[in-house]
């Protein structure tokens, strides 16, 4: 008789989750020589230990501390790029601008990017059927707590000028409920960070509006200013040209506004 299993509202653990995490770890440590000392089996064990046999609505940041410790790495604190609702362009940018880093360019972010996972209380099984949804079920689920933990630490590490890429095509360009709006913004340290510079990415071909004047950007400016951090904002009218100019800054067309 099959054992009763809790039905959650969200999708289940990504198929082949253990193999994916392990393979990503191996790949990452091969690509990044400074991380070659990392034992990927230990990383997987620590990752697994954070959520296996635990109630998937009762996960804490402490559960992830062994993994955080194993994933310790160096990221220049003045080369951090945060993003909200525009992950692909942010990642394309750091692939070209190799000295800048998003959270997913770090080992821990790379391991978990786009994956879902959860376990079950008192069994060593991974739940591939369903996992808790942040809204419908609970916020202290394995995935949400992981991203909250690593995002907080990433923001706490930032210094000097921090950049954030925002999606100008969305109704809320700055969303207080996003990871950036709810976690990262509030963990930038005023003693370390001088300025937050927002890059608002335009979607439409002929969109020449100044999206830095958008009410949600003004709300972000207010939040940042209240943290005693300076705020600046730039429109990126043509993201395709923006990326091209990052690749080839000497191009004559790159002197004009992008």
């Amino acid at each position: 008789v099959p054992r009763w299993r809790q039905q959650w509202s969200g999708p289940g653990t990504t198929k082949r989750f253990p193999e994916t995490v392990l393979a990503r770890c191996v790949k990452y440590t091969e690509i990044h020589p400074e991380m070659r000392h990392v034992d990927c089996q230990s990383v997987w064990d620590a990752f697994k230990g954070a959520f296996i046999s635990k109630h998937p609505c009762n996960i804490t940041e402490e559960d992830y501390q062994p993994l955080m410790k194993l994933g310790t790495q160096t990221v220049p604190c003045n080369k951090i790029l945060l993003w909200s609702r525009i992950k692909d362009l942010a990642h394309q940018f750091t692939q070209v601008q190799r000295d800048m880093f998003t959270l997913e360019d770090t080992l821990l972010g790379y391991l978990a990017d786009d994956l879902t996972w959860c376990g079950e209380f008192n069994t060593s099984k991974i739940n591939y059927q369903s996992c808790p949804d942040w809204r419908k079920d609970c916020s202290n689920n394995p995935v949400s707590v992981f991203w909250k933990t690593v995002s907080r630490r990433f923001a706490e590490a930032a210094c000097d000028v921090v950049h954030v890429m925002l999606n100008g095509s969305r109704s809320k360009i700055f969303d207080k409920n996003s990871t950036f709006g709810s976690v990262e913004v509030h963990n930038l340290q005023p003693e370390k960070v001088q300025t937050l510079e927002a890059w608002v990415i335009h979607g439409g071909r002929e969109d020449s509006r100044d999206l830095c004047q958008d009410p949600t950007i003004k709300e972000l400016e207010s939040i940042i200013s209240k943290r005693n951090i300076q705020f600046s904002c730039k429109n990126i009218y043509r993201p395709d040209k923006f990326l091209q100019c990052v690749k080839n800054p000497e191009d004559s067309s790159c002197t004009s506004e992008i």
């Epitope: 790495q73 990221v75 604190c77 590490a157 005023p190």
Partner: antibody, heavy 114, light 111 residues
Framework: QIQLVQSGPELKKPGETVKISCKAS????????MNWVKQAPGKGLKWMGW????????TYADDFKGRFAFSLETSASSAYLQISNLKNEDTATYFC???????WGQGTLVTVSA | DIVLTQSPASLAVSLGQRATISCRAS??????????LKWFQQKPGQPPKLLIY???NLESGIPARFSGSGSGTDFTLTINPVEADDVATYYC?????????FGGGTKLEIK
């Protein structure tokens, strides 16, 4: 150029109150937090806390909760440190230092003596 | 609170020689490999002057005779070669975690 100019020395009796000022110039005052640091005669530096110059919200180190108060006069680009119910052990030079601790005031000597 | 322990409390160095000051933190002052540790020089009657930030970065206008090294919990300020003008007390400070604590100071004298 950026400057922090503090008020002059103070001689006070135990139990009295002192208020020292730190006037900033050369930058937008509300853009950078202001730290306060204590240095007793012949002793080391002790961070007292900081004040958010945009909101006026103070943060105090544990040893400076109670009798110590940070405040602002934004229109005058000035930060203030007030110490009430002065004790002999408050005798020290008090420094203001802008966010980053690159720019410091010249210091204000407060002497508490009966 | 993070405790910063400086050693030695005082040292005497001949002109032109190397001075080395140590600062040890009770817990790591680093995050993502960035050590948020500063070094200051203070002369009598003056406010402290920032020499080094983030453990090894030389503040603008500071002579290259001053250098900082270390990470995590163990840090060193080196002055090489020492000049007469370097007579002062040197302090380390961490800003990784509130409260932003200072070390006890190291007094540098000329032999």
């Amino acid at each position: 150029q950026i400057q922090l100019v503090q008020s002059g020395p103070e001689l006070k009796k135990p139990g009295e109150t002192v208020k020292i000022s730190c006037k900033a110039s050369g930058y937008t005052f509300t853009n950078s937090g202001m730290n306060w640091v204590k240095q007793a005669p012949g002793k080391g530096l002790k961070w007292m806390g900081w004040i958010n110059t945009y909101t006026g919200e103070p943060t105090y180190a544990d040893d400076f909760k109670g009798r110590f108060a940070f405040s602002l006069e934004t229109s005058a680009s000035s930060a203030y440190l007030q110490i009430s119910n002065l004790k002999n052990e408050d005798t020290a030079t008090y420094f203001c230092a802008r966010r980053g601790f690159v720019y410091w005031g010249q210091g204000t000597l407060v002497t508490v003596s009966a | 609170d993070i405790v910063l322990t400086q050693s030695p409390a005082s040292l005497a160095v001949s002109l032109g020689q190397r001075a080395t000051i140590s600062c040890r933190a009770s817990e790591s002052v680093a995050i993502y490999g960035n050590s948020f540790l500063k070094w200051f020089q203070q002369k009598p009657g003056q406010p402290p002057k920032l020499l080094i930030y983030r453990a090894s970065n030389l503040e603008s206008g500071i002579p290259a005779r001053f250098s900082g090294s270390g990470s995590g919990t163990d840090f060193t300020l080196t002055i090489n070669p020492v000049e007469a003008d370097d007579v002062a007390t040197y302090y380390c400070q961490q800003i990784n975690e509130d409260p932003y604590t200072f070390g006890g100071g190291t007094k540098l004298e000329i032999k």
